[in-house]
Structure formats: C-alpha cells, structure tokens
C-alpha cells in the first residue's frame, strides 16, 4: 500500500539514518507526567558510551543574526568569523556521522553535547581529535589511575590530531547531588592542554550527574524536566589558539590594527552565553508551568563573576530547603543548578546584570509558550493565502494551494508523483507551530495519501533544520494517513518556532497527496479564542447599541458568535447605520491581538460587514478608537456571508471592553465574531 521515497530537499541534501523513530503520541510519551519508575532490571548499572570529537569550525557569536552588533563593534560592515574548536558528538566510533542536535539541545550553541550519567554508572568517552593541533578530554570527575601509582609519570594530557583515546570512569557518590539537592548536578568537561587557551578556543561542555533512576532509559535524559545549560563567559579571541589565523581572516592586508588598542581588544572579546551574544542564542523554548532546570556555568578569571537574572520569573535553589531567588551570583569555576516553573507565556530575557557584561551583550531571550494556544493557522480558512503555499512540483492541476484541510471538489488537494517532493508554507512571520493535521484525497474511486513524512523548518528560508523533537533517532518520522478522508493530528513536542515549514513525504499511497492544517500560535502565545464561539463569554457579556427583532426571529447581541447555526444566528442592529456597535465585556483586562468576523445568510440573502472600526475602554464609559500609524484604523471585514476573516491588532489592545463599529456592509449589518488574545499579565 505504501510507496517509499528517500528524502532530498530543494536546498540541500539531508542525511538521516533509516531508523524510523516511533511517533510520540500522548499515550506513548508525555513530557509532563511520564512515569519514571523503572523495572528492577534498570537497577543494574550501565556504561554510558559517548563518541566525542574536537572539530574545528567557523563561529560568529550570533553576530550575523543580531541587528545590534555592528552598531557596537567597530567593524567594516561584514560580520567577522572566527575559527574555533568544539566538542562534537558522533553516532559511533567511526566518527563519520555527526549527531544532529535537534530542538532540545539547540541551546547548547558552542558547548559540547550533554554527558549524562547516574551514580554508580560508568562513563566511557571515546575522544577523537579531528582538529589541527593537540587537545584533550578532561573533567575533574575523571580519576586517572596512573596518577595514583607511586612514581608514575604525569599523565599524557593531549591527543594528537587524528588520534583517538578512550576515557573510562565510574561516577562516585561525591560527584552526585546530595539527597537535599535537585535530581541532577552540573559539572564541565574541557580540554586541558592549556586550559585557558583551550576554553577560549571553544572546548567546553556540560556533564550532568544524577540521582539513581533519574534518567529515562530510552531517551537518556530526565523527561519530566526540561534542561538548559548556560555557560556565561567572556571569550577572548586574543587567547585562542587560532588568534593569528583569525586576525588574518578578519583584518586583511594592509591591516593597521594596533594590538594594544583598547578598541581592538574589546572587538576580540565576546561577552557570551553558550557562545552567542546580544539575544541570539537559539533554542530556549519551554512550556508554561513545566518544570525547567537551568545549569549555570562560568569559567575564567575573576572578571567572569556574573549576576544572573531571568526577567519576569523567579527561580529556586535547593540546599536542604528550596529558596526562591530573582538573582544568582555565579563565580568562575562554579556550576550551579536552579529550577523554575515559568508561569507567564511570552518572550523573556536571561541576562547578566553586571553593567559591562550586559552592555556588551551577555543576554539572550527565552520563549515560554502556552499549550492552550493551539489554533488553526489558516490553511482551511484561507487566512494562509495561496501564494504562501509552494511545492517542489505538482501533478496536473493538483496544486499546492489546494492543500487545505477539508477542501472539496474533484481536484481538492496537492498531489505529486515525483519522488523527493516537498510542500512548503510561508507563515510570513515566525510562529509557534504546535502540530499538523493531515488528510489525503480521493481521485475517482481511489485513495491517495501520505503515510509517513518528515518536517523541516526555517526562520529565513535559507537555513533549514530537520525536526527531531523527542525522537531517539536523528530525526522524527511522523505517521500520517491511512486513507483519503481521515484526519491525522501529529503534535510537535517541543513545538517548532519557524516562519517556513516544509513537509517531505517519505512513504505514500499511489501519489503523495495532501490536505493539511497547521496548529499553532503567535510567539507570545496570545492569539487564543477568548470565548465567543465556545460560550466562555456569556450572553450577558455581549451587548449592543440595538438589535433587530420581528415575529420570526430575534437577532440579539448574544447571537454574534462565530459559526453559530440556527434561524437567527448573528447580531443585527435595529437599523443599519455607522453609529451601531456590538460590545464585549471580558470582565477583566485582556490582551486582545485580533478579531475574527463572519457574516450570515438569511432567507437566501447574504449579509455581512465589509468595514468596521474598533474601540476599547477600561471602564465602559470612556472609549478610544483603535489607531494605527497615527490615524483611525479601518478594518477590512468580510467579502461573503460565510468565510471568517481574521484581522490582527498591532499593537495589541489591553482592555476590558471592546466594541465593533460597522462602517460599510452588504444588504444588512450582520455579525458573528470571535476575539483573539490572552489574559493580560503583570510584568515585574
């Protein structure tokens, strides 16, 4: 029933291993409440084997993605790149296949991969030096037996280029958190040929030691907690092994730089978090009210004392008891573990509050999303327009623009018979994408659908990432449809943050054929329906300037609910003029980010509002019209009686009361609506 294709994208070839990772359905995997009790067999201690290489690569400290950088740095306008050396994880001892990090580890940036183990476990690290000079693998936890032998020579602490060395040690109790501390404790591993130069060159990574029975056997991590390691340090490129080479790259002859010039020195020092400056560290994405553990690391001289602050949030430290804190002082060589329950959705900042560091860019953003904010992004409704949907090709008239959930007709989907195909949606702005609903289509009497697919995504349309999510493989293979009409809802956990999303069929029936909807939200998790359609907003909360009634029907304000059915299923005013209004009282201040409007059809007559104004009030007495760019905004409403039209409010309104003022209409003023937004949050 299934035809199989290998993946090839339009912009690059993606290598991935053929192991299909089982889709994480709610019943299989739940990051919030997975039972971590393991069978008695799991008490047998294991050896955890990591394949890690020192690999040289170019690094720009996130400067190419930051709009602020060149303002602060005396550069020629081009972003400088620095050769660095990093710890890179590989799939096996052949060191040919690097391990793709995926969303959960994207935040590590320049850091090496997590090495995790429980007390009494053995850790085995096979280290290969793929760099051009000697490096080592070292952690203060490693006990070198030869050091204990009487009269032994000092250990040979370097591995030459293209050499491989295996390190093996047992995790002792003194390395682990005490019973009064959090489940896992952070250490670091690094290279110590020349500790200072090696770290400034980029060789450092997090090593986590956990209580017994903490790590999930399948995932090798604690699945009930989301973990983030943040390494605060000043990377000084003048102390890197590659300083001379980087100078030549970034300052081509004739180069007039004076080494002792303070401006030059500052331009080669990067106040970074995981090797990123100025809010550019990616991957700090977490769910509201989900337990988050931060491992805070610092290395270097005494200038690397940092005062860590998470805006809008407090965190806890645990030393016998738990203490709530808003600020943590981090000292060089100290690795601290703190936990947080992010209570407020939105985009927040983690930063070092010490002036010099903060000014130089030692801050980054973290995104807290609400799992409640999962609405259709507009494939079915048409809010996502035809031009936003493109594909590698199409079969006949089965065009990408038809790939809309529930679309009907004899040709009613995207379809292609080509292998290595893809379909792409441009959301026009970065969004949180929580999931995808897919459907096949019928041609004649046959069933065409995609049974397995992978997802790729991008913020800029150039650099693409393959979605890995919670998969234990190198990427997530999603199971799609089994017929032409059923809807399969696949959830992205963690969600995808992207402007562009691309679906690549890997297995299909007859031809790759798709109708779909994307489920998601804006980056602030603030475009949820506030309750008109669901009736969370009660009838009493909806009022109007007047309403039309006759012996057959009453078109009262409480009927102004999106998709309402019935004989009288909308609000209509008593008379049609621009002074009429419909009002919603949210009963508390809400953040309103959009309105969805819909007309109605009555006795074969289509009625709808073509243009409207919006006003808001905090007290129900004083009203302010919504302005944009210095003038009253006239919103473009409906063009028929049935299709919902979404209008965004930018900037959002913080209001208790909202009014819609119809300004032009077809036949009669008639309105069904939904308000989009979220609860207004106190900032502190």
């Amino acid at each position: 029933e299934i035809t199989r294709t290998t993946l090839q994208s339009d912009q690059e070839e993606i290598d991935y291993d053929d192991t299909i990772s089982v889709e994480m359905k709610k019943e299989d995997f739940d990051i919030y409440d997975e039972d971590e009790n393991q069978s008695p067999r799991s008490f047998q201690k294991k050896t955890r084997h990591y394949f890690i290489a020192a690999v040289e690569r170019l690094w720009d400290y996130g400067m190419s993605s930051s709009p602020h950088v060149l303002r602060n740095r005396a550069q020629s306008g081009s972003v400088p790149q620095f050769k660095k050396v990093v710890f890179q994880e590989f799939t096996d001892g052949s060191f040919t296949q690097p391990l793709y990090r995926g969303e959960l580890n994207e935040h590590l940036g320049l850091l090496g991969p997590y090495i995790r183990a429980e007390v009494e476990d053995n850790i085995m690290v096979t280290f290969r030096n793929q760099a051009s000079r000697p490096y080592s693998f070292y952690s203060s936890l490693i006990s070198y037996e030869e050091d204990q032998r009487q009269g032994a020579e000092p250990r040979k602490n370097f591995v030459k280029p293209n050499e491989t060395k295996t390190y093996f040690w047992k995790v002792q109790h003194h390395m682990a958190p005490t019973k009064d501390e959090f489940d896992c404790k952070a250490w670091a591993y690094f290279s110590d040929v020349d500790l200072e130069k090696d770290v400034h060159s980029g060789l450092i990574g997090p090593l986590l030691v956990c209580h017994t029975n903490t790590l999930n056997p399948a995932h090798g991590r604690q699945v009930t907690v989301q973990e983030f390691a943040l390494f605060f340090t000043i990377f000084d490129e003048t102390k890197s092994w590659y300083f001379t080479e980087n100078m030549e790259r970034n300052c081509r002859a004739p180069c007039n730089i004076q080494m002792e010039d303070p401006t030059f020195k500052e331009n080669y020092r990067f106040h970074a978090i995981n090797g990123y400056i100025m809010d550019t560290l990616p991957g700090l994405v977490m769910a509201q009210d989900q337990r988050i553990r931060w491992y805070l690391l610092s290395m270097g001289s005494n200038e690397n004392i940092h005062s860590i602050h998470f805006s809008g949030h407090v965190f806890t430290v645990r030393k016998k008891e738990e203490y709530k804190m808003a600020l943590y002082n981090l000292y060089p060589g100290v690795f601290e573990t703190v936990e947080m329950l992010p209570s407020k959705a939105g985009i927040w900042r983690v930063e070092c509050l010490i002036g010099e560091h903060l000014h130089a860019g030692m801050s980054t953003l973290f995104l807290v999303y609400s799992n409640k904010c999962q609405t259709p992004l507009g494939m079915a409704s048409g809010h996502i327009r035809d031009f936003q949907i493109t594909a590698s090709g199409q079969y006949g008239q089965w065009a990408p623009k038809l790939a809309r959930l529930h679309y009907s007709g004899s040709i009613n989907a995207w379809s292609t018979k080509e292998p290595f195909s893809w379909i792409k949606v441009d959301l026009l702005a970065p969004m949180i994408i929580h999931g995808i609903k897919t459907q096949g289509a019928r041609q004649k009497f046959s069933s065409l659908y995609i049974s397995q697919f992978i997802i790729m995504y991008s913020l800029d349309g150039k650099k693409w990432q393959t979605y890995r999510g919670n998969s234990t493989g190198t990427l997530m293979v999603f199971f799609g449809n089994v017929d032409s009409s059923g809807i399969k809802h696949n959830i992205f956990n963690p969600p995808i943050i992207a402007r562009y999303i691309r679906l690549h069929p890997t297995h299909y029936s007859i031809r790759s054929t798709l109708r779909m909807e994307l489920m998601g939200c804006d980056l602030n998790s603030c475009s949820m329906p506030l309750g008109m359609e669901s009736k969370a907003i009660s009838d009493a909360q909806i009022t109007a300037s007047s309403y039309f009634t006759n012996m057959f029907a009453t078109w009262s304000p409480s009927k102004a609910r999106l998709h309402l059915q019935g004989r009288s299923n909308a609000w209509r005013p008593q008379v049609n003029n621009p002074k009429e209004w419909l009002q919603v009282d949210f009963q508390k201040t809400m953040k309103v980010t959009g309105v969805t409007t819909q007309g109605v059809k009555s006795l074969l007559t289509s009625m709808y509002v073509k243009e409207f104004l919006i006003s808001s009030s905090q007290d129900g007495h004083q009203w302010t019209l919504f302005f944009q760019n210095g003038k009253v905004k006239v919103f473009q409403g409906n063009q028929d009686s049935f299709t919902p039209v979404v209008n965004s409010l930018d900037p959002p309104l913080l209001t208790r009361y909202l009014r819609i003022h119809p300004q032009s209409w077809v036949h009669q003023i008639a309105l069904r609506m939904e308000v989009l937004g979220c609860e207004a949050q106190d900032l502190y």
Partner: antibody, heavy 120, light 107 residues
Framework: EVQLVESGGGVVQPGRSLRLSCVDS????????MHWVRQAPGAGLEWVAV????????YYADSVKGRFAISRDNAKNTLYLQMNSLTIEDTAVYYC?????????????WGQGTLVTVSS | DIQMTQSPSSLSASVGDTVTIACRAS??????LAWYQQKPGKAPKLLIY???RLQSGVPSRFSGSGSFTDFTLTINSLQPDDSATYYC?????????FGGGTKVDIK
Amino acid sequence: EVQLVESGGGVVQPGRSLRLSCVDSGLTFSSYGMHWVRQAPGAGLEWVAVISYDGNDKYYADSVKGRFAISRDNAKNTLYLQMNSLTIEDTAVYYCAKDLIESNIAEAFWGQGTLVTVSS
Amino acid sequence: DIQMTQSPSSLSASVGDTVTIACRASRDIRNDLAWYQQKPGKAPKLLIYATSRLQSGVPSRFSGSGSFTDFTLTINSLQPDDSATYYCLQDSDYPLTFGGGTKVDIK
C-alpha cells in the same frame, strides 16, 4: 510487474450464479478503486461495475444492475463479482481493472481475463 | 450516458505511415480519456490516459491529444507490431463507456 489474476469463470446455465475473483499481487490494492469490464466474443469492451477503495461506493452498468454485485476484501487483496440470474448475453471474457490513476510506479492496470460462458 | 463514437471502424496502412484515430464524446469529458490497444486473445493494454499522458513502457510513437469532446490517437511511423484493435474510454462519468473500436491492419 504487478499482476491482476482473475479466476472463477466457466460454463454455467442461464438463471444460475457464478462468482469471479481477482487477486492483486501488488502492494497498492487497498488504495485503488477497482472495476470489472467484459468483452463478448467478437464484440467491443463494455464496462460492468466499479467499487471504491474502501468498498463503500459501488456503481453498475444498467445491463447488470440488480443481478451483479461487486465487492472486495482488502485484507486478501481480492476483488469479487457475484453474478446472479445469468443470461446468454452475459457470455464474455471478464477483466478486472484498476482505476486509471497516475503514480510514479508502473502498474498493471488490467488482468488477463476469465471466460464466462452462459449456455443451456 | 456519455456515448463514445470512434472513427474509422477499420483502416489499413503501411509500415512507416502516420495513423490517426478519432474519438468523439456526446458531451464534455474534460481530459478524462484513455486509449487501449488489444490484440486477438489478449487483454487490452493501456497506451494513453488523461488524454495525452503516455503509460510507462509504451513507445513514444504513440501520442494523444484533444479536449472537451474531440480526441485523437496518433501513431507515428507505424510498425508491424501495431496491428491491433484500438479503443477509447471515457472515465469522466459513470457508467464508463468505450468507443466501438478501430481495427488497424498493416498492408
């Protein structure tokens, strides 16, 4: 190449019944709409019936409506034609055929046929 | 029902000739037309579907064209192996209907 193989044909008296089968040795049977087409000796082709991929939709030619029943068993990759109240005019070679849907793999769309002779 | 009228009912041509067979539908069938080749004692073989799409494995000397109600099968550079009866089929609406057939002989 994927093969469709019909069976169940033979000589039968008018008014009697016969059941034809068509087995698909390929992997895509459960996705395709399936047809029966017949050809009387020395005559042209005549479409008989169609069934959708899931068995929910069926259509028949007027000449067989009420007498013939098309069905399928996707678990067995098999298409059936139950023929009742046979008449001499039903004498023909019966072919099973797949919906004409283009894919990127070569499909055998027709079987080789099975002969049904209705004779007293 | 949609009637399919095929012409001519038979023709004779020499090897290397170009042969054209016409098929007319009693109403618009968009491009839902297929052409079959049948040799004596054999099952029909699909040549062309969706008016002009060549089935894989079919020589490129066969081509189809047309739209709405008028359709054509063209055989360029006729070969001895092309001696057969050719049928058109509309699969735009039920019941599906075939043309009466065109018998092609090689002189």
